[in-house]
């Protein structure tokens, strides 16, 4: 059961001094928004018992495992139902306290009633201030039954509930007709899900036999021990003034637990602390009585004396609940009431015993829940005891439950039951989450949901490059912190897996599912400079750039050249895929366009800072080609060219350019300008005799236009070697006349 206690301070002379405190002994209780546990909640539950609104109650947290409710201004504030909720996940548990007004017309003889399934429950409301009206019984706020005012027996109104079932559980109240609800007697009925002494699904399992008023939990078979008692079967008394599953809490104030009501998880309910009784838990137990509400009788034998907190205190030579066992009878010593092991481990369990005659190895045995008996493999004999060691076969889940150590000698026998919890090592259900990445590190959140049992003691993160067969690197981390995987390779995928462990041997769970995390590509930091550019034609631009000289390798995959045509609102991007490149030829540009040009280094998909932008004006494109070019030899050194003007001219032609080249020759061509653009004929002079020439021409407006078709022609005869071609132009008709 969850270690959760709701304390009510019942010194009611002054409501302002009244307080409720909820204390959790759970590991990590109340830590709030972290991954390990929701906070403790303590509140008044107005769903069934409604009281007039007052100033809001004050909630104060004392550390992580205690919360206190104060600020009650008048007695009516106290009446009703209060609840505390604690524990995490499936263990989340609600503890309920029902408060009755001391001045009510009717008072409960007993507030909490815990009964077994099928039992008859009897609720008894004692008349405190008589009214000659009917008594209405309600269940969970709804009408249930009416008793006539003269049906009281010995000043009590009784409600009998035969054959109760778990749905009958809840808050019951008895109220005089037309009286204030605050004058009601409020009860809490808890119906266990099983018959007496049974627990589990189908109620097939036997309870361990809870001592000292402990109540067997119908779901897990554990004893919910009264305040002031501990152990698997509540067999041990705490020191006076202490409570909690391990006696770890202490009652506040100098008078110990006097005046405090203790409420524990169902099916226990509420009671006074050990050694106290009465409606306000202010009366000490009568002689011969002890325990919570003084419900237990000592009946000490052999000279034992009764302590109202712990029961019989035995004289030397005797032990047992009633001092009925002689020390000659063997006795199991210091057996832990609960042990925890991890699944599939093979633990060693020790069991120590003393007695007269002295126990030997063969006289101590260990019995598993399925009845299997284990014999000890080794015994350590000391002057005052024998300790038997048992090697337990590999544990399975079915081994969870009550085990028993038994010692038998000729002096008698003793046995001690203890609970073994077989825990399943945690296995992550999801892969770890990537928080941030850099070129050489990944920041990972390792905390994921898991199957199996907590608490998580360690988190191991295993990682290695994707598709690698190398050993996994492992880092052990704090469960609540993010992890930074360092010294990784840039631009590399890593397979990352989580492994969780819980405390104890064999607590390491299987590895969780892998996830792929890729390191970043570092940002390119270098800003290039555009060092030069020149036009290689109306649509071609050669660009060169430089980078700052920095130590170390260049971080970059290449360069991006951007040309922005502001007039048309168009951007042209040219990718240069070598980081060593420092020049590029841009072709297919729009002639006559003003471009803004810059260059930047790129790495993966990241762009570095751009160079300062440069402004480049491409020359406009020239006119179309001249039409119908024709060549005619005039002599051994002259050839006449004729043509027609280009069509659809964008403006007046400034000149023509003629290209002359010897057919089949390897030398450079010669360009001759025709500076009178209105002419359609020219004579090329100074040519070599009997030589074949190639001619083509183009017009120029602001820029040079397209070339015409190429024509071939040979000079005549065997004249002298000419100095080189020259030209003479005139109108075509005039040339023909000549």
């Amino acid at each position: 059961a969850v270690d959760l206690t709701l304390l009510a301070n019942l010194r009611l002379t002054d409501p302002q001094r009244f307080f409720l405190t909820c204390v959790s002994g759970e590991a990590g209780a109340g830590r709030g928004s972290d991954a390990w546990g929701p906070p403790l909640l303590l509140e008044k539950d107005d769903r069934i018992v409604r009281t007039p609104p007052g100033p809001p109650l004050r909630l104060a947290r004392n550390g992580s495992h205690q919360v206190t409710l104060r600020g009650f201004s008048k007695p009516s504030d106290l009446v009703g139902v209060f609840s505390c909720v604690g524990g995490a996940g499936a263990r989340r548990t609600r503890v309920i306290y029902v408060h009755n007004s001391p001045g009510a017309h009717l008072l409960p003889d007993k507030v909490t009633h815990t009964v077994n399934k099928g039992d008859t429950a009897v609720l008894s409301a004692r008349v405190h201030k008589e009214k000659q009206t009917d008594v209405i019984w309600k269940s969970n706020g709804s009408y249930f039954y009416t008793l006539d005012w003269h049906e009281a027996q010995d000043g009590r109104f009784l409600l009998q509930l035969p054959n109760v079932q778990p749905p009958s559980s809840g808050i019951y109240s008895a109220t005089y007709l037309e009286a204030s609800p605050l004058g009601s007697a409020f009860f809490r009925l808890i119906v266990r899900g099983c018959g007496a002494g049974r627990w589990g699904p189908g109620c097939t399992k036997e309870c361990p036999g809870c001592l000292h008023g402990g109540v067997c939990h119908d779901h897990d078979g554990e004893c919910v021990c009264p305040p002031g008692f501990t152990g698997t079967r509540c067999e041990q008394a705490c020191r006076e003034g202490r409570f909690g599953q391990s006696c770890q809490e202490q009652c506040p104030g100098i008078s110990g637990c006097r005046g405090l009501t203790f409420c524990l998880p169902d099916p226990y309910g509420c009671s006074c602390g050990s050694g106290w009784r009465g409606s306000q838990c202010q009366e000490a137990c009568a002689p011969g009585h002890f325990g919570a509400d003084c419900r237990l009788q000592c009946q000490c034998q052999n000279g034992g004396t009764c302590d109202r907190f712990s029961g019989c205190v035995c004289p030397s030579g005797w032990h047992g609940v009633h001092c009925e066992k002689s020390d000659r009878i063997p006795q199991i010593l210091n057996m832990a009431s609960e042990l925890e092991f991890n699944l599939e481990t093979m633990p060693r369990i020790n069991c120590a015993a003393a007695g007269n005659p002295f126990p030997v190895r063969g006289s101590i045995e260990l019995r598993k829940p399925d009845g299997t008996v284990l014999l000890s493999t080794k015994a350590i004999v000391e002057p005052e005891k024998t300790t038997a060691e048992f090697e337990v076969p590999r544990l399975v889940l079915a081994d969870s439950g009550f085990w028993e150590c038994r010692v038998s000698t000729s002096g008698g026998q003793d046995s001690r039951r203890f609970k073994v919890n077989v825990k399943v090592p945690p296995v992550p259900l999801a892969a770890p989450r990537l928080l941030t990445k850099q070129s050489r590190q990944l920041v990972v959140s390792p905390l994921v949901s898991f199957s199996g049992d907590g608490p998580i003691s360690t988190v191991r993160l295993h990682y290695r490059p994707q598709d690698s067969t190398m050993d996994w690197s492992t880092i052990v981390v704090d469960p609540s912190e993010n992890v930074t995987l360092m010294n990784l390779r840039p631009k590399t995928g890593y397979s990352v897996r989580v492994q969780l462990s819980r405390p104890g041997e064999g607590g390491e769970g299987a590895w969780g599912p892998p996830t792929l995390m890729t390191t970043d590509c570092p940002e390119p930091l270098l800003q290039p400079w555009l060092e030069g550019w020149h036009v290689e034609g109306t649509d071609r631009l050669r660009v060169s750039w430089s980078l700052p000289l920095v130590p170390g390798p260049l971080v970059g995959d290449g360069f991006l050249l951007r040309l922005w045509d502001g007039t048309r609102g168009q951007e042209r991007r040219e990718n240069v895929s070598s980081p060593q490149a420092r020049t590029a030829l841009l072709t297919g540009l729009t002639p006559g366009t003003h471009y803004q040009l810059d260059v930047q280094l790129y790495h993966c998909t990241l762009l570095g800072p751009a160079s300062p932008p440069a402004h480049v004006l491409l020359p406009p494109s020239g006119p179309p080609a001249p039409r119908h070019l024709h060549a005619q030899a005039l002599s051994d050194s002259e050839i006449q060219l004729t043509w027609k003007h280009p069509e659809a001219l964008p403006g007046p032609i400034s000149k023509y350019v003629v290209e002359v080249q010897v057919a089949g020759g390897a030398g450079d061509p010669l360009w001759i300008d025709v500076d009178r653009p209105e002419e359609t004929s020219t004579i090329i002079r100074g040519l070599n005799a009997s030589t074949r020439y190639l001619f083509r021409m183009r017009a120029s407006i602001q820029g040079l236009g397209d070339w015409s078709n190429t024509v071939e022609e040979s000079t005549l005869g065997n004249g002298l070697q000419a100095e080189g071609p020259v030209q003479e132009s005139r109108a075509a008709e005039e040339g023909l006349d000549q």
């Epitope: 940002e523 930091l525 430089s546 700052p548 800072p609 160079s611």
Partner: antibody
Framework: EVQLLESGGGLVQPGGSLRLSCAAS????????MAWVRQAPGKGLEWVSV????????FYADSVKGRFTISRDNSKNTLYLQMNSLRAEDTAVYYC??????????WGQGTTVTVSS | DIQMTQSPATLSLSPGERATLSCRAS??????LAWYQQKPGQAPRLLIY???NRATGIPARFSGSGSETDFTLTISSLEPEDFAVYYC?????????FGQGTKLEIK
């Protein structure tokens, strides 16, 4: 020791011209970009102009474009700023700075330019 | 142009205290941000480059953080010589632009 030393500042009338110089020493001048940054009296820093290591590329703030010209002589380890058509708002301390790829890592002590009639 | 806005304009602190100066860009500048310190009558000095890298010779009490549009310069424990004006500057886009400065003065 790495050093930059500005000179050429002074008082000039509106519309007039000045030429600032910045002499570099203690480092290989020709492999660094260089910049001019100014600071008007009581005001913050304002970036003015930059030139590439070879001098092949220059860039200017809009406020000085067409009036100022940045240049360098790598053989003399010197940076220049030719300032024409000066205005009252050009009054400032002018700093030259070495541009490494990540920022301006070396600064001169500055030279004062006052434009007033 | 990218606008750089620094806050606060003036920060009054005592030696030994922690100083946090903020710089915001009007659009993303990635991590291309530098911080400069300027004392009266002196030239600026580069402190931090590329948002978080200390320049040569800068004491470890100076640190920078942030990316995209929001950046912080932190001085973990102020020394008397740290009281000055601090400027941020982006190198992501042209023209390069500075913030208007934060004056760190002794309280």
């Amino acid at each position: 020791e790495v050093q930059l030393l500005e000179s050429g500042g002074g008082l000039v009338q509106p519309g007039g011209s000045l030429r600032l110089s910045c002499a570099a020493s203690g480092f290989t001048f020709s492999i660094y970009g260089m910049a001019w940054v100014r600071q008007a009296p009581g005001k913050g820093l304002e970036w003015v102009s930059v030139i590439s290591p070879s001098g092949g590329q220059t860039f200017y703030a809009d406020s000085v474009k067409g009036r100022f010209t940045i240049s360098r002589d790598n053989s003399k380890n010197t940076l220049y700023l030719q300032m024409n058509s000066l205005r009252a708002e050009d009054t400032a301390v002018y700093y030259c700075a070495r541009v490494y790829y990540y920022g301006m890592d070396v600064w001169g002590q500055g030279t004062t330019v006052t434009v007033s009639s | 142009d990218i606008q750089m806005t620094q806050s606060p304009a003036t920060l009054s602190l005592s030696p030994g205290e922690r100083a946090t100066l903020s710089c915001r860009a009007s659009q993303s500048v990635s991590s291309y941000l530098a911080w400069y310190q300027q004392k009266p009558g002196q030239a600026p000095r580069l402190l931090i480059y590329d948002a978080s890298n200390r320049a040569t010779g800068i004491p470890a009490r100076f640190s920078g953080s942030g990316s995209e549009t929001d950046f912080t310069l932190t001085i973990s424990s102020l020394e008397p010589e740290d009281f000055a004006v601090y400027y941020c500057q982006q190198r992501s886009k042209w023209p390069r632009t500075f913030g208007q400065g934060t004056k760190l003065e002794i309280k």
